[in-house]
C-alpha cells in the first residue's frame, strides 16, 4: 500500500517549500510562465497502480534533482533546502519500496513510458527557463510556485491511489 506517511511527507515538503520564499512573488508577476504541467499524468484513474507510482517517483526524483544543483544551493536558505531535500529523498525511498511490493501483484509493465517522458519534458522546460533567466531570484521564485503546484497535484494523486487500496 502507498503509505499515508508519503502523503504527509509531501505535505511537509510543501510547507518547507512555502517557507523557502525569499523575495516577494508580487515583484515577479511579469516573469511567470506556463510550463505545461502534464496534469493528465496525475489522473490516477487512467493508470494501474504501479504505473501511477512510477509517475510519482519520476516527479519527486526530478524535483530532487532540480533542488540539488549548485545554482539551487545559491538561491535558497541552506537549512530549509536541506530539510526539503531530505523530505524528498525519504519519499523516493518510500515509493521505491511501494514499487517493489506492487510489481509482484500486477501483470503490467512497471513504467508508463509516455507519462515518464511527459514529466521529464516538463522539468526540461523548467530548467531551460532558469537558464534563460540566468537563475535570477525572480526565476527561482516562479519555479518555486510551479513546483508547489506540481507537488499539490502529486499529493492529490496519492490520495486517489490510497482510496483504491
Amino acid at each position: 500500500d502507498l503509505p499515508q506517511t508519503h502523503s504527509l511527507g509531501n505535505r511537509r515538503a510543501l510547507i518547507l517549500l512555502a517557507q523557502m520564499g525569499r523575495i516577494s512573488p508580487f515583484s515577479c508577476l511579469k516573469d511567470r510562465r506556463d510550463f505545461g504541467l502534464p496534469q493528465e499524468e496525475f489522473d490516477g484513474n487512467q493508470f494501474q497502480k504501479t504505473q501511477a507510482i512510477s509517475v510519482l517517483h519520476e516527479m519527486i526524483q526530478q524535483t530532487f534533482n532540480l533542488f540539488s544543483t549548485e545554482d539551487s544551493s545559491a538561491a535558497w536558505e541552506q537549512s530549509l533546502l536541506e530539510k526539503f531535500s531530505t523530505e524528498l529523498y525519504q519519499q523516493l525511498n518510500n515509493l521505491e519500496a511501494c514499487v517493489i511490493q506492487e510489481v509482484g501483484m500486477e501483470e503490467t509493465p512497471l513504467m508508463n513510458e509516455d507519462s515518464i517522458l511527459a514529466v521529464r519534458k516538463y522539468f526540461q522546460r523548467i530548467t531551460l527557463y532558469l537558464t534563460e533567466k540566468k537563475y535570477s531570484p525572480c526565476a527561482w521564485e516562479v519555479v518555486r510556485a510551479e513546483i508547489m503546484r506540481s507537488l499539490s497535484f502529486s499529493t492529490n494523486l496519492q490520495k486517489r491511489l490510497r482510496r483504491k487500496d
Partner: antibody, heavy 120, light 111 residues
Framework: QVQLQESGTVLARPGASVKMSCKAS????????MHWVKQRPGQGLEWIGV????????TYNQKFKDKAKLTAVTSANTAYMELSSLTNEDSAVYFC?????????????WGQGTTVTVSS | DIVLTQSPASLAVSLGQRATISCRAS??????????MHWYQQKPGQTPKLLIY???NLESGVPARFSGSGSGTDFTLNIHPVEEEDAATYYC?????????FGSGTKLEIK
C-alpha cells in the same frame, strides 16, 4: 474544512480607526497568502492588499497604502486589517479571502465579511 | 491600473438559453502561455464564488455549463443552458500586474 471567520459589524466616527479580524481554520494558515477586498453597498469589488502570515510580508494596492494596515498573528491563526482616518467612503463590507493556485492569484475561500459603517 | 470593463451591465436570459458576459481589459493580462483573468459569481447577501481561473479553467465543483474563453484583453464568460440558480452578479478579476482589479459586475436575471 476551510473557514474564514470575520469580526462583526463596526460603527465608527469619521476620523477614527477600526481593526477587524479574520480567523482561519481548516488549513495551514502560515503557507497561504490572505487577500483583503472591499465592497461598497450595491457596488463592485476592490482589491486592498495581501499578507503572507508566514513572515508578515505585505503588498498593497497603492490606493489603500495609507488607509489600510495588514497584520497577522500566527499563534492565533488570525489576520487583521486596520483602517485609519475613516471617512464615509470607507463605509463598506470588507472580506478576507484566501489566495488560491499559488501565483495565479485567485481567491477561493471568503470570509462572511465585516460591515463597517462610518457615521457622525 | 488595468481597468476591466464588463458588458452588459445587466442582462435577462430565458431559462435554458445562453448568457454571454464580456470583460475587456485596458491592457493585456496574458503572458507566456497564461491569461491571468478569473471569473466570480456573487448571489445577493452571499460572498463571491470562484467559477473560472486563468480565463478558461473550470474550478472544481462548478457545473460544466459555465465556460470561459479569451486572451490578451478580451474575455468571455458563457453560461449555457442557464438555470434559475444562476441569477447573480458576475465579476471578472485580473492578476496580470499590481494592483489586481475587478470588473464592475454584470447582473444576470433569469426570465
Amino acid at each position: 474544512q476551510v473557514q474564514l471567520q470575520e469580526s462583526g459589524t463596526v460603527l465608527a466616527r469619521p476620523g477614527a480607526s477600526v481593526k477587524m479580524s479574520c480567523k482561519a481554520s481548516g488549513y495551514s494558515f502560515t503557507t497561504y497568502w490572505m487577500h483583503w477586498v472591499k465592497q461598497r453597498p450595491g457596488q463592485g469589488l476592490e482589491w486592498i492588499g495581501v499578507i503572507y502570515p508566514g513572515n508578515g510580508d505585505t503588498t498593497y494596492n497603492q490606493k489603500f497604502k495609507d488607509k489600510a494596515k495588514l497584520t497577522a498573528v500566527t499563534s492565533a491563526n488570525t489576520a487583521y486589517m486596520e483602517l485609519s482616518s475613516l471617512t464615509n467612503e470607507d463605509s463598506a463590507v470588507y472580506f478576507c479571502t484566501r489566495n488560491y493556485k499559488y501565483d495565479y492569484y485567485t481567491m477561493d475561500y471568503w470570509g462572511q465579511g465585516t460591515t463597517v459603517t462610518v457615521s457622525s | 491600473d488595468i481597468v476591466l470593463t464588463q458588458s452588459p451591465a445587466s442582462l435577462a436570459v430565458s431559462l435554458g438559453q445562453r448568457a454571454t458576459i464580456s470583460c475587456r481589459a485596458s491592457k493585456s493580462v496574458s503572458t507566456s502561455g497564461h491569461s491571468y483573468m478569473h471569473w466570480y459569481q456573487q448571489k445577493p447577501g452571499q460572498t463571491p464564488k470562484l467559477l473560472i481561473y486563468l480565463a478558461s479553467n473550470l474550478e472544481s465543483g462548478v457545473p460544466a455549463r459555465f465556460s470561459g474563453s479569451g486572451s490578451g484583453t478580451d474575455f468571455t464568460l458563457n453560461i449555457h443552458p442557464v438555470e434559475e440558480e444562476d441569477a447573480a452578479t458576475y465579476y471578472c478579476q485580473h492578476s496580470g500586474e499590481l494592483p489586481f482589479t475587478f470588473g464592475s459586475g454584470t447582473k444576470l436575471e433569469i426570465k
